[in-house]
Amino acid sequence: AQNITARIGEPLVLKCKGAPKKPPQRLEWKLNTGRTEAWKVLSPQGGGPWDSVARVLPNGSLFLPAVGIQDEGIFRCQAMNRNGKETKSNYRVRVYQIPGKPEIVDSASELTAGVPNKVGTCVSEGSYPAGTLSWHLDGKPLVPNEKGVSVKEQTRRHPETGLFTLQSELMVTPARGGDPRPTFSCSFSPGLPRHRALRTAPIQPRVWEPVPLEEVQLVVEPEGGAVAPGGTVTLTCEVPAQPSPQIHWMKDGVPLPLPPSPVLILPEIGPQDQGTYSCVATHSSHGPQESRAVSISIIEPGEEGPTAGSVGGSGLGTLALA
């Protein structure tokens, strides 16, 4: 089959090879598209509701006045010339629509080095097929999941037109000591080949370099944070800064209602103590600084004969902290 691409809304003429230029003609067109159930046969006589979608011209060609998404599919013509020789034409029709120029919305004017930042959201409206959005830094493609780059993509389809809206949100972690004014742009690449990419106007956020803080270290004992039921876990938040900052504790991203302390002891671990812990150091001179998170989990204890066992009471299970 010969591949044909046609722009949505434009007319399309498909030639019926071997057909006499004028009537009388012995030919028929067969269509298998989004408008048909299996094969639809069209003859030169025409007539009926199909004439507004596709009709056979006097020279035997098939004319579609305004191609739509539902016209994608297979078109076949079978014609017999005056000598009775049969010729077949076979077309695979795909349609496309080029969207408007993509835009970057919600763009950041300033990024902070060393932490993830949202750069902006690239939006392309009215494409078919969907196509893809890609981001560029200083003209070079940005690869998601590499060097602190992450991209969140969303594709929506218009319920009536069937055209696509693409959204791509870019997050980056600028390197400390890197370019203070990076240039970001976004481009739309059509789903069908032989159409050039459309690029947004560039944006140039400033990169702010925070005063480097010595890292907050969270040490867990036992190492790895896996403990037998009823065991003890000690979390120690170590901050080299002077004077010593206030240390607060978080569990699963939620602050724990405990007085500030660099040590958190879970004296008798129960299921309710499992989760992800981190500490937050608050300095008077700069904002809060969070440690890495550690996961505390309960493991099956090793086999080693009976222990002295648990003694009276039901155990604390809850957090204890001086």
């Epitope: 003890t232 204890p301 222990t307």
Partner: nanobody, 116 residues
Framework: QVQLVQSGGGLVQAGGSLRLSCAAS????????MGWYRQAPGKQREWVTT???????DYAASVKGRFTISRDTAKNAVYLQMNNLKPEDTARYYC??????????WGQGTQVTVSS
């Protein structure tokens, strides 16, 4: 098989001092924490203090400044020095040893009674 042997409890007047000892014998490798807990009659067991493998210590608010935990790693022993004792410190005191990958081991308990 690990055995924990506790000693040092007894009767003391308010304001007095006591020292509790807890020694572990048997297979006592990979200890990462040692601690003291107590249980007063009719109450739940409560945590008193812990010392970690790295020597980090912490105390319950009710004993901070009065009790001190220490250890002797060569003897696999943990101690609790209790000063300025109060009647509300009256309880049975238990030591506990945490070993990596195993259920914790508890001592048999030692009674501390503080009279007013």
């Amino acid at each position: 098989q690990v055995q924990l042997v506790q000693s040092g409890g007894g009767l003391v007047q308010a304001g007095g001092s006591l020292r509790l000892s807890c020694a572990a014998s048997g297979s006592v490798s990979s200890i990462y924490a040692m601690g003291w807990y107590r249980q007063a009659p009719g109450k739940q067991r409560e945590w008193v203090t812990t010392i970690t493998g790295r020597g980090i210590t912490d105390y319950a608010a009710s004993v901070k400044g009065r009790f001190t935990i220490s250890r002797d790693t060569a003897k696999n022993a943990v101690y609790l020095q209790m000063n300025n004792l109060k009647p509300e410190d009256t309880a049975r005191y238990y030591c506990k040893i945490d070993r990596r990958g195993y259920a914790p081991y508890w001592g048999q308990g030692t009674q501390v009674t503080v009279s007013s």
